[in-house]
């Protein structure tokens, strides 16, 4: 039975040209995290394998930095980065947990962070 929950940074906004940290946290389970994938709907951004370390997709290598922790830092943001991001936790023995973050990249200098929320 999957008892865990993923807490994410929720709906967030950031300025064009700036950077943002995408963070998820898995709680309420003793399952072992074997790998975390960071994805958009149609493509892989990065993988953090607990044993083998990080893989960053070549199309993001210039502006994605691993961490902090299992998170991902997106740099040099453009308005095209607006959209949904998913953290996919591969765990043993529970299976897969998925968290969702919506990022809005703003032209203006007003970029307020949304509240954190949980996805069961």
């Amino acid at each position: 039975m999957m008892t865990g929950t993923i807490e994410t940074t929720g709906n967030i906004s950031a300025e064009k040209g700036g950077s943002i940290i995408l963070q998820c946290h898995l709680s309420s389970t003793t399952a072992q995290v074997t790998q975390v994938n960071w994805e958009q709907q149609d493509q892989l951004l990065a993988i953090c394998n607990a044993d083998l370390g990080w893989h960053i997709s070549p199309s993001f290598k210039d502006r994605v930095a691993p961490g902090p922790g299992l998170g991902l830092t997106l740099q040099s943001l453009t308005v095209n980065d607006t959209g949904e991001y998913f953290c996919i936790y591969h765990t043993y023995p529970d299976g897969t947990y998925t968290g969702r973050i919506f990022l809005e990249v703003l032209e203006s200098s007003v970029a307020e962070h949304g509240a954190r929320f949980q996805i069961p």
Epitope: A50, D51, G53, H55, I56, S57, K61
Partner: antibody
Framework: QVQLVQSGAEVKKPGASVKISCKTS????????LHWVRQAPGQGLEWIGG????????SYAQKFQGRATLTVDKSTSTAYMELSSLRSEDTAVYYC????????????WGQGTLVTVSS | DIQMTQSPSSLSASVGDRVTITCRAS??????VVWYQQKPGKAPKLLIY???YRYTGVPSRFSGSGSGTDFTFTISSVQPEDFATYYC?????????FGQGTKLEIK
């Protein structure tokens, strides 16, 4: 340039163990993950497992869990793969392969080590 | 484990032909697929990664495409040195798995 040089061919009896080395050069040893892949005669490629030289973290294919052991010696920039309880179906060419910085693609390969298991 | 199914298993072509090899993953692997070339008695060589980037020094006649579960590897004009076996591999999750290989032979 990046080089992976493996130890020579081995002939072993069933039940024995074999330990193959993979000496690397041309890059910072702790920056690239090292993997082991085998190929039985006339067959395809099979991933055995990988090791992160930075922290010693290992990942194995289930088939080899408990029978293969991957280690590294940072002082000599060398990776090792030991396979125990050998059987005839373990006869294969064993390759070490390096994946680049923040990458899982196997960009660098050793020349291969033929292990023959025969009574 | 993720299965990678390659087709065809063998392929005959003449120099100058355009050839296409396909690889199907048993589940979504996004863009985490690479292609290798192997010649008899030699170690594999990385050709294409993620899955449309040519590795350093790889000629432009080699290309790759696809995302999700379906991937394609193409040689636009086969050269004599291209006759070899080609493998796809996924690195979306461990264990990293290979296709069974496609042997490209001279017609």
């Amino acid at each position: 340039q990046v080089q992976l040089v493996q130890s020579g061919a081995e002939v072993k009896k069933p039940g024995a163990s074999v330990k193959i080395s993979c000496k690397t050069s041309g890059y910072t040893f702790t920056e690239y993950t090292l993997h082991w892949v085998r190929q039985a005669p006339g067959q395809g490629l099979e991933w055995i497992g990988g090791i992160n030289p930075n922290n010693g973290g290992t990942s194995y294919a289930q088939k080899f869990q408990g029978r293969a052991t991957l280690t590294v010696d940072k002082s000599t920039s060398t990776a090792y793969m030991e396979l125990s309880s050998l059987r005839s179906e373990d006869t294969a060419v064993y390759y070490c392969a390096g994946s680049g910085y923040y990458d899982y693609s196997f960009a660098y390969w050793g020349q291969g080590t033929l292990v023959t298991v025969s009574s | 484990d993720i299965q990678m199914t390659q087709s065809p298993s063998s392929l005959s072509a003449s120099v100058g032909d355009r050839v296409t090899i396909t690889c199907r993953a048993s589940q979504d692997v996004k863009n985490a697929v690479v292609w290798y070339q192997q010649k008899p008695g030699k170690a594999p060589k990385l050709l294409i990664y993620s899955p449309s980037y040519r590795y350093t020094g790889v000629p432009s006649r080699f290309s790759g495409s696809g995302s999700g579960t379906d991937f394609t590897f193409t040689i636009s004009s086969v050269q004599p040195e291209d006759f070899a076996t080609y493998y796809c591999q996924q690195h979306y999750s461990t264990p990293f798995t290979f296709g069974q290989g496609t042997k490209l032979e001279i017609k």
